[in-house]
C-alpha cells in the first residue's frame, strides 16, 4: 500500500492550524470499515490520532488534532493540527492499513516572525567622535533562532565586536539581544537585521548618530 506525504516540511506559524498531508490509493470497493489509520510522533512513537473499524478514535494529542472524515474514503488521511505550538515541531508518521499496510513521515516546521527590533545606545548622551558606544538590538518572540546581521550606513557588514544572545521563553519562542561595540565616527548609521531563516523574514532596526541629538528611526 503506497502512502504519500509531501517531501518538504510543512511550515506553520505558531498559533495557526496546520494540515499534515497524507494520502493513499484505495482499491475498488474500499470501505471505511476496512481502514485502520494511525498518526504518531515518529521519534517517541506517541499516539497522535487514530481511525479504526469505520470510527474516528479521536485525538490522543491534547485534543488538538482532527481528521477530514469526508475525505477519508477518497484516500485522504491528512491530519489537522490546531493552534500549533513550538513543541509540536518534528516528524509525524502516517500509518495506513487496509489489507496491506504502508507508512510515511511528514515533518512539521514551526515558525514565528520576529518583532521589529528596538535599538538602545549606551552611553546615550554627550557622545563625541572616537567614543566607544554599545548599541543593543532587541527583537522578540520569534522562532526558530534568528540570524543577526549588522551594517553601517554604507551597507558595509560589521562583524567584529558583536555579541548575540537568544533566550527561549516558556512557549519556546526566542528573544534576541545583539550587542555591537563600535567607535563613533563624525556621524553614522548602524543597522541591525534580524532574519527568520524559515520564513525568510527580515526585521530591521537602525540608529543614526549625528553629533547631537541622535535619532532612532
Amino acid at each position: 500500500l503506497e502512502v504519500q506525504v509531501p517531501e518538504d516540511p510543512v511550515v506553520a506559524l505558531v498559533g495557526t492550524d496546520a494540515t499534515l498531508c497524507c494520502s493513499f490509493s484505495p482499491e475498488p470497493g474500499f470501505s471505511l470499515a476496512q481502514l485502520n489509520l494511525i498518526w504518531q510522533l515518529t521519534d517517541t512513537k506517541q499516539l497522535v490520532h487514530s481511525f479504526a473499524e469505520g470510527q474516528d478514535q479521536g485525538s490522543a494529542y491534547a485534543n488538538r488534532t482532527a481528521l477530514f472524515p469526508d475525505l477519508l474514503a477518497q484516500g485522504n488521511a491528512s491530519l489537522r493540527l490546531q493552534r500549533v505550538r513550538v513543541a509540536d515541531e518534528g516528524s509525524f508518521t502516517c500509518f495506513v492499513s487496509i489489507r496491506d499496510f504502508g507508512s510515511a513521515a511528514v515533518s512539521l516546521q514551526v515558525a514565528a516572525p520576529y518583532s521589529k527590533p528596538s535599538m538602545t545606545l549606551e552611553p546615550n548622551k554627550d557622545l563625541r567622535p572616537g567614543d566607544t558606544v554599545t548599541i543593543t538590538c532587541s527583537s522578540y518572540r520569534g522562532y526558530p533562532e534568528a540570524e543577526v546581521f549588522w551594517q553601517d550606513g554604507q551597507g558595509v557588514p560589521l562583524t567584529g565586536n558583536v555579541t548575540t544572545s537568544q533566550m527561549a521563553n516558556e512557549q519556546g519562542l526566542f528573544d534576541v539581544h545583539s550587542v555591537l561595540r563600535v567607535v563613533l565616527g563624525a556621524n553614522g548609521t548602524y543597522s541591525c537585521l534580524v532574519r527568520n531563516p524559515v520564513l525568510q523574514q527580515d526585521a530591521h532596526g537602525s540608529v543614526t548618530i549625528t553629533g547631537q541629538p541622535m535619532t532612532f528611526p
Epitope: 494511525i38 473499524e53 492499513s97 489489507r99
Partner: antibody, heavy 117, light 108 residues
Framework: DVQLVESGGGVVRPGESLRLSCAAS????????MSWVRQAPGEGLEWVSS????????LYADSVKGRFTISRDSSNNSLYLQMNSLRAEDTAVYYC??????????WGLGTLVTVSS | EIVLTQSPGTLTLSPGERATLSCRAS??????LAWYQQRPGQTPRLLIY???SRATGIPDRFSGSGSGTEFTLTISSLQSEDFAVYYC??????????FGGGTKVEIK
C-alpha cells in the same frame, strides 16, 4: 493453495547472526503484508516483525528492534529475517505468516532457532 | 502496548461439552481481535477474526463474541480434534501486535 515454507534455522552462539527465509506460493505475494511470529519452547506466541507488500514499510517488536531486519523479494516470492546479535531469549520456533488486515490467515510450519553457548 | 489476558490457563473438559474461553484486553480494542488454534506439534490456525467472523473452512461449532475489552471463544460441542491451545491476538494497535498467553483445552 497458500504455502509458506521457512528455512535457515539452526544452532548459534550468543552474539552471532542467522538469516531465515520463507518461500511463499499460492497467492499474489506483493499484494500482502508478511510477518514473522515466534514461539519459545513451551511458551506462547510473540509477534516479531511485519513488512508491507511493497517492502517499503516495516514494523518491529521492541524486543528485536535494532537487531533484526525484515525484508522481502517479490521476484522470487521470498520473505527474510536477518537476525544479528542473537541472545539466548531469541531461542524459538520462527513462523512466517501471511497477514491480512494485521491478523494472520496462513502460517508456515516454522523453523527452530537455538541460541546457546 | 495492549496486554491480553486469557483465562482460564487450562480448561479440562470431555468431548461433547461446551468450552468457553475468555480473553480480556487492557484497554478497548473495539472488535480487532483474532483467535487461533494450535494443536500439539502443529502450526497455529486462524479460527476467528473481527471478534466474531469465522475464517474460511472453520466449523460452525466455533464462535466468537465480545467487543471493547471482553471477548469469548465458544466451542459448542468439543470434538477430539479440538483439544489444543487457543490464543487470542489484538490488532487494534497494529504497530505493536500482541497475543494472549493461551488457554489449553485438555481432555478430562
Amino acid at each position: 493453495d497458500v504455502q509458506l515454507v521457512e528455512s535457515g534455522g539452526g544452532v548459534v552462539r550468543p552474539g552471532e547472526s542467522l538469516r531465515l527465509s520463507c518461500a511463499a506460493s499460492g497467492f499474489t505475494f506483493s499484494s500482502y503484508a508478511m510477518s514473522w511470529v515466534r514461539q519459545a519452547p513451551g511458551e506462547g506466541l510473540e509477534w516479531v516483525s511485519s513488512i508491507s507488500g511493497s517492502g517499503g514499510s516495516t514494523l518491529y517488536a521492541d524486543s528485536v528492534k535494532g537487531r533484526f531486519t525484515i525484508s522481502r523479494d517479490s521476484s522470487n516470492n521470498s520473505l527474510y529475517l536477518q537476525m544479528n546479535s542473537l541472545r539466548a531469549e531469541d531461542t524459538a520456533v520462527y513462523y512466517c505468516a501471511k497477514a491480512r488486515n494485521n491478523f494472520f490467515d496462513y502460517w508456515g510450519l516454522g523453523t527452530l532457532v537455538t541460541v546457546s553457548s | 502496548e495492549i496486554v491480553l489476558t486469557q483465562s482460564p490457563g487450562t480448561l479440562t473438559l470431555s468431548p461433547g461439552e461446551r468450552a468457553t474461553l475468555s480473553c480480556r484486553a487492557s484497554r478497548s480494542i473495539l472488535t480487532s481481535l483474532a483467535w487461533y488454534q494450535q494443536r500439539p506439534g502443529q502450526t497455529p490456525r486462524l479460527l476467528i477474526y473481527g471478534a466474531n467472523s469465522r475464517a474460511t473452512g472453520i466449523p460452525d461449532r466455533f464462535s466468537g463474541s465480545g467487543s471493547g475489552t471482553e471477548f469469548t471463544l465458544t466451542i459448542s460441542s468439543l470434538q477430539s480434534e479440538d483439544f489444543a491451545v487457543y490464543y487470542c491476538q489484538q490488532y487494534y494497535d497494529w504497530l505493536t501486535i500482541t497475543f494472549g498467553g493461551g488457554t489449553k483445552v485438555e481432555i478430562k
